[in-house]
């Protein structure tokens, strides 16, 4: 619900300017740490690193998407997994990883110069088994690339990455989806976590930058799962 | 041009209710998050809660938790505040306001409610 | 809850000054701050979102900076239309919360 979303510090898709669609998980970001979700009358953090059976794209990472673990396997035991690479086979836009989408089913990069103004995707955003919006943008809708001239700057309302300038990723803030900058050597990031029912996240982080990956913080190892910090790190 | 229009001044006497309405036009009603807020006299803007006018899915500030309750009628575009146990300290003027992103871009013009015995 | 302190609490500036309001937050907001200024009797309205960015219609007179903690709202040069009640907010962590005003009177 939109009670478990925004009594929280913590967030995934975001809808774009003006009555856009709300994008899928494509876009490049990760989820605050201390996800909060409303417990009784008070916030209350849940860390959850358990891998997570799902229903839909939505549920997993933005590393992620929802399947079948076997070719051709009851749809009825999807679990999130790891998206497929550039070049890799797809059947969908959520199968490949952030930067790609999935065409004559094939991962491709989303830089290309066509991509933009090829597609028009229809998106949906959901929130655990509700469909709704968050800044309210509408919940299924065609959104046609030609709505985007420039690049957002820091601070613009987004729908995905790719309306970002460069050194910016789209990312959800309470109840829009915003550009913002790309993680540097040494801020903290955040490692993918299974959503349930507990509501999409309402802050997102970026992804790290070229050359940086998210990894556990060396003196943070001995700390308690629900503790651990994570930091852009060289590879 | 977006435009939210509220209900007018109402006068209430404590442990009463008050419901204030949010007429919105100008764009799609059911594609942007209705806050509310308030200001008591010469006090800070206090944010109250914001609703989903798709769902009606709703979040509260927690300290008007249990107290307030947003709806919101698709038919007329409309959504309400309807705040209980009215206490003096409850006088404020209550605004709608409608977000385009994290902030606050469009406003009702306010709803005076004034709690006294 | 994230506690905003603006100041000063008012000012007085005359027609053509340079004005500046800072407003303060108790912890780190990164950039997510915005400014709004209201008229007596009027609903607030957004001059500055995400620090500095300005909405769209507001004057160019209008600016935002800072990070972190500490932020500053400028008026390049003040015109008697700009007489009312700014305001700051932080988005960075629900609930949003605001700081008490900063009303500015002209000489």
């Known amino acids: 619900t939109l009670n478990s979303v925004l009594n929280s510090n913590a967030i995934k898709n975001l809808p774009p300017p003006l009555g856009g669609a709300a994008g899928h998980p494509g876009s490049a970001v990760s989820a605050a740490p201390g996800i909060l979700y409303p417990g009784g009358n008070k916030y209350q953090t849940i860390d959850n690193y358990q891998p997570y059976p799902c229903a839909e794209d939505e549920e997993c990472g933005t590393d992620e998407y929802c399947a079948s673990p076997t070719r051709g396997g009851d749809a009825g035991v999807q679990i999130c997994l790891a998206c497929r690479k550039r070049r890799k086979r797809c059947m969908r836009h959520a199968m490949c990883c952030p930067g790609n989408y999935c065409k004559n089913g094939i991962c491709v990069s989303s830089d290309q110069n066509h991509f933009r103004g090829e597609i028009e995707e229809t998106i949906t955003e959901s929130f655990g088994n509700d469909h709704s919006t968050l800044d309210g943008y509408s919940r299924r809708t065609t959104l046609s690339s030609k709505m985007y001239h420039t690049k957002g700057q820091e601070g613009s309302v987004c729908l995905r990455s790719s309306d970002c300038a460069s050194g910016l990723c789209c990312a959800r803030h309470f109840w829009s989806k915003i550009c913002k900058p790309v993680l540097k050597e040494g801020q903290v990031c955040t490692k993918h976590r299974r959503k349930g029912s507990h509501g999409l996240e309402i802050f997102q982080r970026c992804y790290c930058g070229e050359g940086l990956s998210c990894r556990i913080q060396k003196d943070h190892h001995q700390a308690s799962n629900s503790s651990r910090l994570h930091t852009c790190q060289r590879h | 041009q977006v435009q939210l229009v509220q209900s007018g001044a109402e006068v209430k006497k404590p442990g009463a209710s008050v419901k204030v309405s949010c007429k919105a036009s100008?764009?799609?009603?059911?594609?942007?998050?209705m806050h509310w807020v308030r200001q008591a006299p010469g006090q800070r803007l206090e944010w109250m809660g914001v609703i989903d006018p798709s769902n009606g899915d709703t979040s509260y500030n927690q300290k008007f938790k249990g107290r307030v309750t947003l709806t919101v009628d698709k038919s007329s575009s409309t959504a309400y505040m309807e705040l209980s146990s009215l206490r003096s300290e409850d006088t404020a003027v209550y605004y709608c306001a409608r977000t385009t992103g994290p902030w606050f871009a469009s406003w009702g013009q306010g709803t005076l409610v004034t709690v006294s015995s | 809850d994230i506690q905003m302190t603006q100041s000063p609490s008012s000012l007085s500036a005359s027609v053509g000054d340079r004005v500046t309001i800072t407003c303060r937050a108790s912890q780190d907001i990164s950039n997510y701050l915005n400014w709004y200024q209201q008229k007596p009797g009027k609903a607030p309205k957004l001059l500055i979102y995400y620090k500095s960015r300005l909405h769209s219609g507001v004057p160019s007179r209008f600016s935002g900076s800072g990070s972190g903690t500490d932020f500053t709202f400028t008026i390049s040069s003040l015109q008697p239309e700009d007489i009312a009640t700014y305001y700051c907010q932080q988005v960075h962590t629900l609930p949003p919360t605001f700081g008490q005003g900063t009303k500015l009177e002209i000489k």
């Open positions: 100008g764009y799609t009603f059911t594609e942007y998050t």
